[in-house]
């Protein structure tokens, strides 16, 4: 059956049991996700805005899929294996009375049974599983996986040791302070800096030590994962964001409608197809797209390119290049090059690299 | 590539009997529910019936409940429905559609057949 | 039960407009909600799932938005291949239908 091909999931709840306090529910579902990550690489986050990978719904009767539920007893819950859309979805029948302890339907236990499912667990022949298909009230403070249950996650996800440090081929979150950590885009918004990472970006507000990472879904539900390239205008309060042969305009951090827009109408060629990196520099008013070994001038106030371009990245950013992941302007005076794990600040006015550092040098590593 | 090639529509008396075959093939059959949509002419779509991976649970639109019948051949990558007491309201195009997940319905369908016409009359 | 309710029913417009079809839910469905075109004589296509998931193969120029009972299907600029039916549907329920037609 299906599983997730990331170790790295988000869960939300979308709505409350009355049964309950609402702090009562998160907890109860915050130690249900803790029972599996505790035998398993998987981590579990909890998000309140955005599309989430696993959806935890009370609801009563028809519900919105093809399975209603059937009122007091019977069908407690249930949920969807992984995948996308429904996948992962667990429902919870809200003509039962959730409780936190043995009286009517213990959350806690009913959520670690349905979080099995919605991890790719079938129901279990052994009894003592928490994946045997029948409710059963065991006491929730000494309670503990079956061996059966164990076995069936490990083999679908492994043990906790394993994959900690992996490359991130699943749009699972990148570790922060991994060496080797790179970005597919950085800008400043105003006084904050914008790290885009596959389906997530970090946010560090100038000057101060913390960061907070967030999915791109949960800021611009209509933004697609993997930006590219990005880039602000201040002085307007836009953000420009590139994917493939499309951008996105943002402003006053709010998507504008219209958009996407094909990166054609700056005026590239017809053989450009995706952007690698942009920054806009508020002296010349101008942005500069970097694509390959190239890259393009673009005058900001007349909306169109400058003559002359593409130039070789190497020719005229002397030790940058011959290709970049992202750039950001800062301080007035520097363009910060991200290429892979390093990072270069390279001073425009002088024309030279004044420091190289780490790409996660920003983040107190 | 998936295909879904739906057969045995055709014209029928009121109070007649009909079973329409659907045949799947390039996805593994075994694994997903499976469903029955209907559109009568010039009308809109209308959910018939599903089943699902194993052919163990089925359900069925109200207007059908009791006189049509959803059934599976994994071994065959077949999929039928029985259909009896047909009315003339039962008049459509049928497709077969196939749902995106196995153990509970979607209620996605991602890949439809081209329909088998099923006609009711006097 | 739940019910759809898809508005407009008929729609005119012409190669290059933006234009927007709604679905309302009678109660919230979270963002379980797919949009379908359906071109004369043929099946129905998946365009949309997940509300404002786009299915592989589909053209950018479409979006959808939405969750709980409000949702809406947006064509940016229409080509002249977009002119059809547009279903949403839920589970079971399939909204009654749009008709986009030329101007």
């Known amino acids: 059956g299906p599983v997730w091909r990331k170790h790295y999931i988000t869960y939300r709840i979308n709505n409350y049991t009355p049964d309950m306090n609402r702090e009562d529910v998160d907890y109860a579902i915050r130690k249900a996700f803790q029972v599996w990550s505790n035998v398993t690489p998987l981590k579990f986050s909890k998000i309140n805005t955005g599309m989430a990978d696993i959806l935890v719904v009370f609801a009563r009767g028809a519900h919105g899929d093809f399975h209603a539920f059937d009122g007091k007893g019977g069908i407690l819950a249930h949920a969807f294996g992984p995948g996308s859309g429904i996948g992962g979805d667990a429902h919870f029948d809200e003509d039962e009375f959730w409780t936190t302890h043995s009286g009517g339907t213990n959350l806690f236990l009913t959520a670690v049974h349905e979080i099995g499912h919605s991890l790719g667990l079938g129901h279990s022949s052994d009894p003592k599983a928490v994946m045997f298909p029948t409710y059963k009230y065991v006491d929730i403070n000494t309670f503990r996986l079956s061996a059966d249950d164990i076995r069936g996650i490990q083999s679908l996800y492994g043990d906790p040791k394993e994959n900690q440090r992996l490359p991130n081929p699943d749009n699972s979150e990148p570790a922060l302070c991994d060496p080797n950590l790179s970005f597919d885009a950085v800008t400043t918004v105003g006084n904050k800096i914008f790290f885009f990472k596959d389906r997530f970006f970090w946010l560090k507000v100038s000057e101060r030590p913390k960061t907070s990472v967030n999915l791109i879904s949960s800021l611009w539900p209509t933004l697609p994962s993997g930006i590219e390239a990005a880039y602000e205008i201040e002085a307007r309060n836009q953000v420009f964001l590139f994917k493939d042969d499309k951008y996105w305009l943002i402003s006053n951090l709010r998507p504008e409608p219209n958009y996407p827009k094909s990166i054609h109408s700056f005026g590239f060629p017809n053989f450009v197809k995706k952007i690698d990196a942009a920054v806009f520099n508020p002296r010349f008013y101008r942005t500069y797209f970097f694509v390959d070994n190239q890259y393009w001038r673009y005058d900001e106030r007349r909306q169109m390119m400058d003559p002359g371009y593409p130039k070789l990245i190497t020719k005229n950013f002397q030790g940058i290049g011959p290709k970049i992941d992202a750039v950001f302007y800062s301080k007035n005076k520097y363009y910060y090059f991200f290429q892979g794990s390093n990072q270069f600040e390279y001073d425009f006015l002088l024309q030279r690299i004044t420091k190289t550092l780490k790409s996660n040098s920003w983040f107190g590593c | 590539e998936v295909q879904l090639l739906e057969s045995g529509g055709g014209l029928v008396q009121p109070g007649g009997s009909l079973r329409l075959s659907c045949a799947a093939s390039?996805?593994?059959?075994?694994?997903?529910?499976m469903h029955w949509v209907r559109q009568a002419p010039g009308k809109g779509l209308e959910w018939v019936s599903g089943i699902v991976s194993s052919g163990g649970t089925t359900i069925y639109a109200d207007s059908v409940k009791g006189r049509f019948t959803i059934s599976r051949d994994n071994s065959k990558n077949t999929l039928y429905l029985q259909m009896n007491s047909l009315r003339a309201e039962d008049t459509a195009v049928y497709y077969c559609?196939?749902?995106?997940?196995?153990?509970?319905?979607?209620?996605?369908?991602?890949?439809w057949g081209r329909g088998t016409l099923v006609t009711v009359s006097s | 039960d739940i019910q759809m309710t898809q508005s407009p029913s008929s729609l005119s417009a012409s190669v290059g407009d933006r234009v927007t079809i709604t679905c309302r839910a009678n109660?919230?469905?979270?963002?379980?909600l797919n949009w379908y075109q359906q071109k004369p004589g043929k099946a129905p296509e998946l365009l949309i799932y997940?509300?404002?998931s786009l299915q592989s193969g589909v053209p950018s120029r479409f979006s959808g938005s939405g969750s709980g009972t409000d949702f809406t299907l947006t064509i940016s600029s229409l080509q002249p291949e977009d002119f059809a039916t547009y279903y949403c549907?839920?589970?079971?329920?399939f909204g009654q239908g749009t008709k986009l037609e030329i101007k």
């Open positions: 109660q919230s469905i979270y963002t379980y």
């Open positions: 559609a196939k749902d995106i997940r196995g153990a509970y319905s979607s209620g996605l369908f991602d890949f």
């Open positions: 549907q839920q589970a079971g329920i």
């Open positions: 390039g996805f593994t059959f075994s694994w997903y529910w």
């Open positions: 997940a509300a404002s």
